[in-house]
Structures are given as C-alpha cells and as structure tokens.
C-alpha cells in the first residue's frame, strides 16, 4: 500500500479572493497540490521465514513500492549495511549478483522484489533474533531501507510479520531530485494555504467550514514521523553472528528509524499467508526528508563487499557502462 | 602495475591438501574482491569462490564446498585457496582473479598454479 | 545452475577474416556477460565486460553485443596474435559460471 498525503476533498475558491491572490497563484495551488496528493512515498518490505525443513535455514524476501527504477539492492544482517550490518547479497537490476555466506542463493523475484536464502549451518549461520535489512537504491526516490527479524517465538515454516522495524531513510540523490521538488511545491502550497486562510474574506458565508485547516495538517508530520527522528537503531544480540553494536548510525550522518507495532492480525499463517502482499513500512516523507541535508557532505554509500554504488540518474540501464573512474 | 603472482606448481598425494598463494600488488588489497577459479583438462572453467579482504567474507560454489577454503593475509597483500582431501579430480590449474566490483568483472588473473594429484 | 553453451568448438579462419563466435545462456542474464581471451600457456585475459564494454587496452577490432540469452563476440580483421580460446563467464547467478570455450584457429 502507497503511502499518500491524504487531502480532503477542495472546495473552489471564493470569486472575492480570485482578485486578490491573482489567477496564475490560484492556478498553481490545485496543480502542486495534485503532484503532492499523487506523489506516494516509496517503500521498503522485508519478509523473515524460517523453513520448516531446516531449522537454523532462513528465506527473507524484500520489495520496493516505488515508481522509481531500482539501480542496487543490499542486503545485511545484523543491522543497516554501513552501521555494524554485515553485507550478505548485492544485487544489480542488469549486472547481476555477488553474495555471501551464509547466503546460498539471492535471487531476483520480480523487476522491484529479491529473495534471498541463507544456510543453516555453520559458525556464521544465522538465529531467530538476527535483524535483516534491505536497501533498495533507485531513481529518483533515492535510497529505502527497512529491516526485519523472525521473532524468537515463531514456528519453523511461519514467517515474521513483514518489515517489523523499518528504517525510512531516504539519500540525496533521490531527495534532491523529483523528490526534493515535489516537497518545495508543497512546501510552497502550504505557505499559500495559510495566506489564503489568514486573508480577510468577507464574502465567505459563516455557515461555511473552512477546509484550510485540515489542508494544513495534511502535510504535518504526524507524531509517531517526529518520534521516529529521534529513535536510534539499537539491536541486542546475544546468541547470533554477527555481533551487533549497542546503538549504530550509519556512516557520514544520522539514521532516522520507526519502530512500528506488530499486530497479531499482520502475522501470516502458513503457506497462504508466505504467499500473500507483504504489508510495507508506512512512514512520512517529512520525518525521512528532515535528517538528510546534514548528509550533503557524504560520500556515495557503500553499498557491499568491494561495492561502491554510483548513482545514475538515467537508471539501471545507464549503468551497464563504466560507472567513474576509480 | 597491477600483478597477481601465484605460487609454483605442486605435486601432492591423493588425501593430503595443499596451500596456494596469490600475492598481490600495484592496488589495494582490500578494494578488491578475490575470486578463485580451477580450469581442467586445460579447457573448461570452474569458479570456485570469492573472498572480500576488508572482512574475510566468504562465498562459495557449492560444488567446492568443503573441498576449497579462501583465506587473506591483508599485512602481506596475500589471499590463499587450501585444498583438501585431495583426488585425482582436484588436478588442474588455480587461478585467483580480481573482482572489480564497479564494472562487474574479472579484471586481472593471476600467473595461475598447476596442482598434480598422483600417488 | 545458468549453463554457457559456446557451440563453436573450433573455428578456422584466415588472417584479416572477420569472425563472431557465440554463447548462450540457459535463462535471462540481462547483461551479466564477461569475455576472456586465453593463449595457450598463458593466464585468461579480460577483453569485453558488461555484454559490450571493452577493458583497457583491448583493440576496438573486438565487439561484444547481445543481451538476455544471446551473446556474441565479433573479431573483425583478424591478427595472427588473436588465435586463442575464448571463453563467455555470467555473473547473473550463483555460481558463475563459464561457456565452454571456442579456440581460434588457422585454416
């Protein structure tokens, strides 16, 4: 599910105000207000099974919701690739694929999903409390990732509720590109809202409801978004490779993280369920876009073992060519 | 110059194991994955497996498993292939091959390491 | 595992031929296709990376094309120098896996 602005319906503006705000600014609202209300934030899900047949065997599978074109996916173990994660798979919409152990096999499922599945034997093999996270870089979104674990409770064969503990972070390339436009547009919006709202208007009928102000906190991050910008990832690992620092950010700036509840209701049972649409991370675009301009000095992310990601604005097709020079 | 210089030729007993070396210079060892790759009968190629020496990171073909073991030696620029229980199966040609992982690619091979299994 | 089929086992050409030689894949590899050269004695070399990328140093007489499950290599005006085995590598898929080989010889 697309996580969207949601706008209550507009009411046309009053003839009194078409000659005070001027009819190209009366224009330009219902068009930046279209690209806000249709410009969903992308997501990230992450799915934890353990089979049945082998107890210590794990299968996560990611997806991105997005309409943008994935140029990399990483996964990690153990938190965030960059902030105490381990890389297991590196995945390239057009390259291919290098991965590591435990990982068997990493595999793409669909043009925006993976899957990958890991071993269960052996010193690095992983356990039930062990967080796997996802990282789908794309254009022009940016970077997404979410993480997930299987709860220590759950059945072999059962997998865990998808992405339990999200990680919303979204990178400069995609922030300051469609993304970054779409949000001075609403930004703007919003600025023209609240003039209009606090403009004298006698020609409005008192019987008449205002609908600016339920416009004007349609953009407010909601309290669990401003919640999330100060929760750091913390992972305690006791029984699982690989060890896991107390609290990690990743590299070159803060990390903003939301914590989401599991609800009984989310949690597939049995096979149908393996096979249903995973429930994706909802989170707002405000609380992921406030944290990034402190990262404008960072070096493109690394993205795996000997990895270094070079976004290109033109896509994964763009990158079947050398990427920069080394 | 980038340079991959591989150990000599070994001539081993059918169940013993022995130890290759790719000694590495003109880069950094550690921008670099390694992979190890066995040509036989001086035709056909087998990737064996990979190594990532930031962190020892291993990856292998599951046919090699158990049969090979990818090590680094990161102050000395050196990455290491052992091979054990070895069968007349296992005489062939080792490379080791750097990985360049911005074009995807085995970019340099090593001088390669001809290993004889005879009793 | 992805098989590399390289059905031209040995091909007989002449100096200044033009020759293309190919290699198929048994599932979609986008353009997860590496190229190497090995003269006899010699370690393989890098010669196209990508499907069509040449490496440093590679002549421009080498061009590799295709996309998916059909992948070519073309050597235009031949040199004595470029007799050899040619062998395709995927890294769609693990394992990587190599094509059989085609050598180069004269008629």
């Known amino acids: 599910m697309r996580t969207e602005a949601q706008v209550p319906a507009l009411q046309p503006p009053e003839p009194g105000l078409e000659g005070a705000m001027g009819h190209r600014t009366l224009v330009l609202p219902w068009v930046l207000l279209t690209l806000c209300v249709t410009a969903g934030t992308p997501e990230v899900w992450v799915q934890v099974r353990m089979e049945a047949t082998e107890l210590s065997s794990f299968t996560i599978r990611c997806g991105f919701l997005g309409s943008g074109s994935i140029s990399l996916v990483t996964v990690s173990w153990g938190g965030p690739n960059g902030a105490g994660g381990t890389t297991l798979a590196v995945l390239h919409p057009e390259r291919g694929i290098r991965q590591w152990a435990p990982a068997r096999q990493a595999r793409w499922e669909t043009q925006s999903s993976i899957s990958l599945i890991l071993e269960g034997s052996g010193a690095s093999s992983p356990c039930a409390n062990t967080t796997f996270c996802c990282k789908f870089a794309s254009f022009p979104e940016g970077s997404w990732e979410a993480c997930g674990s299987l709860p220590p409770s759950s059945d072999p064969g059962l997998s865990a509720p998808p992405t339990p503990a999200p990680i919303l972070r979204a990178d400069l390339a995609g922030i300051l590109g469609v993304s970054g436009v779409l949000l001075f547009g609403c930004v703007y919006l919003l600025h023209l809202l609240r003039r209009h709202k606090h403009r004298p208007a006698p020609r409005l009928q008192p019987s008449r409801t205002s609908p600016q102000a339920p416009r004007a906190r349609a953009w407010a991050p909601s309290q669990a978004s401003q919640a999330a910008l100060h929760v750091p990832y913390a992972t305690i690992n006791t029984s699982c490779r690989p060890a896991t620092l107390d609290t990690a950010h990743p590299h070159g700036g803060p990390s903003w993280w939301a914590s989401l509840p599991t609800h009984a209701a989310h949690r597939p049972q049995g096979p149908a369920a393996w096979a249903s649409t995973p429930i994706p991370a909802r989170g707002s675009f405000v609380s992921v876009e406030n944290g990034l301009y402190a990262q404008a000095g960072e070096r493109p992310p690394h993205t795996g073992p000997g990895l270094t990601l070079f976004p290109d604005p033109r896509g994964p097709r763009a990158m079947e060519g050398p990427l920069g020079v080394r | 110059e980038v340079q991959l210089q591989q150990s000599g030729p070994e001539l081993v007993k059918p169940g013993s194991l022995v130890k290759i070396s790719c000694k590495t210079s003109g880069y950094t060892f550690t921008d670099y994955n390694m992979d190890w790759v066995k040509q036989s009968h001086g035709k056909s190629l087998e990737w064996i497996g990979a190594?990532?020496?930031?962190?020892?990171?291993?990856s292998y073909n599951q046919k090699f498993k158990g049969k090979a073991t990818l090590t680094v030696d990161k102050s000395s620029s050196t990455a290491y292939m052992e091979l054990r229980s070895l069968t007349s199966e296992d005489s062939a040609v080792y490379y080791c091959?750097?990985?360049?992982?911005?074009?995807?690619?085995?970019?340099?091979w090593g001088t390669g390491t001809t290993v004889t299994v005879s009793s | 595992d992805i098989v590399m089929t390289q059905s031209q086992k040995i091909m007989s050409t002449s100096v200044g031929d033009r020759v293309s030689m190919t290699c198929k894949a048994s599932q979609n590899i986008r353009s997860a296709v590496a190229w190497y050269q090995q003269k006899p004695g010699q370690s393989p070399k890098a010669l196209i990376y990508l499907t069509s990328n040449r490496h440093t140093g590679v002549p421009d007489r080498f061009t590799g094309s295709g996309s998916g499950t059909d992948f070519t290599l073309a050597i235009s005006d031949l040199q004595s120098e470029d007799l050899a085995d040619y062998f395709c590598?995927?890294?769609?898929?693990?394992?990587?896996?190599f094509g059989g080989g085609t050598e180069l010889e004269i008629k």
């Open positions: 190594i990532d020496p930031k962190n020892g990171a291993t």
């Open positions: 590598l995927q890294h769609w898929n693990y394992p990587y896996t």
């Open positions: 091959a750097r990985w360049d992982s911005n074009y995807w690619y085995f970019d340099v």
